[in-house]
């Protein structure tokens, strides 16, 4: 009688993530009595993944009744396939021994490789807001794939993006990889309302990408411009001063009107209004007594926004004596070069 | 280590019966089947049958049909070989012993043996 | 059921000596026999099973060979220890069944 041989007909088995693998193995002869054990990997280092008579194996069942008498296919399957279970299987014949079974012969090996799809692209901007014409950085993440070719692409509003740097850790085997690029972003004051996305290609996916995006508007600050202008009389001894406060975002927005360089009022941005590109404007003004100052009025509007410095923007307003029987005083708006007066 | 540890010495009048027991150590119980041998004084051996505890499956020898009964305990892994009508040609050492299979009869691990004297 | 021929039933030998037992089986078992030491007041010992693989732990001196019908036991250097009974079996068919034994002596 022929000498037992352990045949693998699968030199590899492809499998998806949270399939069932099935590894093939028959045996030619029932003799020597033993039993039959699979192993990942080979040499003294090799996993237990079945043994037929001791320990509990939970994933694994096998094709056929190994108890039956003429059994000679040890095929098994294993269930839930991830990643970590990538790797060479071997079939090993033993034969009865004490205290151990003794190794009689193993089949050639079948390559178990599992296909596992990316984790859902992970985009982050970076950690403190910046301005218009500034270059940011994006990142995007995306794990536990398999195998290891993979294909990402930036765009921005849906053109795409040529400065990015991309990995894909580990540089050798593994059972899966991670990728992680950077890309570089100019913002511009229309910004609020753009999108960054990363794009994931991969074979799991049947040439439907995975996408992760990010809004630039958790990253941009547009400074604000401040206009201050003096309208019309209102009274006869007041003069309505308002700031104009344009193109800001985000909203986090404080103001405050200083008198000569005393704190008139402030006030926190509430009913603002919103333009097309994303950014907001608001208005504040200030009501002023002329007939309470003697002398010339530097009005000022000082506006904190987003927990940056303050920037200012003021008005001059003229103080002039008239004769007391007029009852009245007179302010006078300077407007650079150009000076009226207001009775 | 592998023990199969047997119940003592057993003396029965004819027509009685007897409960030998084998427990089982340093294997799983339920992965091997347990055989039960005889050997009467000055003789050679007789398979009398088998159980496997997986399963509770049994196969007796003919000769001892209707009057052995093969049972076993997962909880204690402890194998039980009753045998009743007994009869002075019963007189025998009775072993019980492990194969890897129902369809394996080589048995590589055999208890120390009980010996059951059939007397009037 | 399949009966196991053995032979000698006894024999006597020296140390040193190539001892050969046979055991012819009633009909084909193809390998599957085995064949186990017993010492006076002991348990068999399992030796040989599927007719030539030696069971761990046990000397290269004991070897078996055959197929078929005819069997073949060899001590090929008799030692002191090794005087017991053997006996031949079949497991390819139950019941299983032994051969009637050789008891095996030191001259």
């Known amino acids: 009688e022929e000498e037992l041989q352990v045949i693998q007909p699968d030199k590899s088995v492809l499998v998806a993530a949270g399939e069932t693998a099935t590894l093939r193995c028959t045996a030619t002869s029932l003799i020597p009595v033993g039993p039959i054990q699979w192993f990942r990997g080979a040499g003294p280092g090799r996993e237990l993944i079945y043994n037929q008579k001791e320990g509990h194996f939970p994933r694994v069942t096998t094709v056929s009744d190994l108890t039956k008498r003429n059994n000679m296919d040890f095929s098994i399957r294993i269930g839930n396939i991830t990643p970590a279970d990538a790797g060479t299987y071997y079939c090993v014949k033993f034969r009865k021994g004490s205290p151990d079974d003794v190794e009689f012969k193993s089949g050639a090996g079948t390559e178990l490789s599992v296909r596992a799809k990316p984790s859902a692209p992970v985009v982050s901007g970076p950690a403190a807001r910046a301005t218009p014409q500034h270059t940011v950085s994006f990142t995007c993440e995306s794990h536990g794939f398999s195998p290891r070719d993979i294909t990402l692409k930036w765009f921005k509003n849906g053109n795409e993006l040529s400065d990015f740097q991309t990995n894909v850790d580990p540089v050798g085997e593994s059972v899966s990889y991670s990728i992680h690029s950077t890309a570089k972003v100019v913002l511009t004051r229309e910004d609020v309302h753009s999108q960054v996305i990363c794009e994931v290609a991969h074979v799991t996916l049947q040439g439907d990408p995975l996408r992760g995006t990010a809004n630039l508007s958790e990253t941009i600050r547009v400074p604000p411009t401040l206009e201050v202008t003096q309208q019309p009389v209102r009274a006869e001894n007041q003069v309505n001063v308002t700031c104009q406060v344009r193109k800001f975002y985000p909203q986090r927005l404080q103001l405050t009107w200083l008198e000569n360089g005393n704190v008139s009022r402030t006030e926190t941005a509430s009913t603002v209004t919103e333009n097309k590109d994303g950014t907001y404007n608001w208005m504040s003004w200030l009501l002023v007594n002329v007939s309470a100052h003697r002398d010339d009025v530097k009005l000022t509007c000082q506006v904190e926004h987003d927990g940056q410095p303050a920037v200012s923007k003021s008005h001059d307003l003229k103080v002039s004596a008239h004769p007391k029987e007029q009852g009245s005083n007179t302010a006078a708006e300077n407007t650079g070069s150009n000076e009226r007066n207001i009775y | 280590q592998v023990q199969l540890v047997q119940s003592g010495a057993e003396v029965k009048k004819p027509g009685a019966s007897v409960k030998v027991s084998c427990k089982a150590s340093?294997?799983?119980?339920?992965?091997?089947?347990m055989h039960w041998v005889r050997q009467a004084p000055g003789q050679g051996l007789e398979w009398m049958g088998y159980?496997?505890?997986?399963?509770?499956?049994?196969k007796y020898n003919e000769k001892f049909k209707g009057r052995v009964t093969m049972t076993s305990d997962k909880s204690t892994s402890t194998a039980y070989m009753e045998l009743s009508s007994l009869r002075s040609e019963d007189t025998a050492v009775y072993y019980c012993?492990?194969?890897?299979?129902?369809?394996?009869?080589?048995?590589?691990?055999w208890g120390q043996g009980t010996t059951v004297t059939v007397s009037s | 059921d399949i009966q196991m021929t053995q032979s000698p039933s006894s024999l006597s030998a020296s140390v040193g000596d190539r001892v050969t037992i046979t055991c012819k089986a009633s009909?084909?078992?193809?390998?599957?026999v085995a064949w186990y030491q017993q010492k006076p007041g002991k348990a068999p010992k399992l030796l040989i099973y599927?007719?030539?693989y030696r069971y761990t732990g046990v000397p290269s001196r004991f070897s078996g060979s055959g197929s078929g019908t005819d069997f073949t036991f060899t001590i090929s250097s008799l030692q002191p220890e090794d005087i017991a009974t053997y006996y031949c079996q079949q497991h390819y068919s139950t019941p299983w069944t032994f051969g009637g034994g050789t008891k095996v002596e030191i001259k």
């Open positions: 340093g294997y799983t119980f339920t992965s091997y089947v």
């Open positions: 012993a492990r194969s890897y299979y129902d369809y394996d009869g080589s048995f590589d691990y």
């Open positions: 159980i496997n505890p997986y399963n509770d499956g049994t």
């Open positions: 009909q084909d078992v193809t390998t599957a």
């Open positions: 599927s007719a030539s």
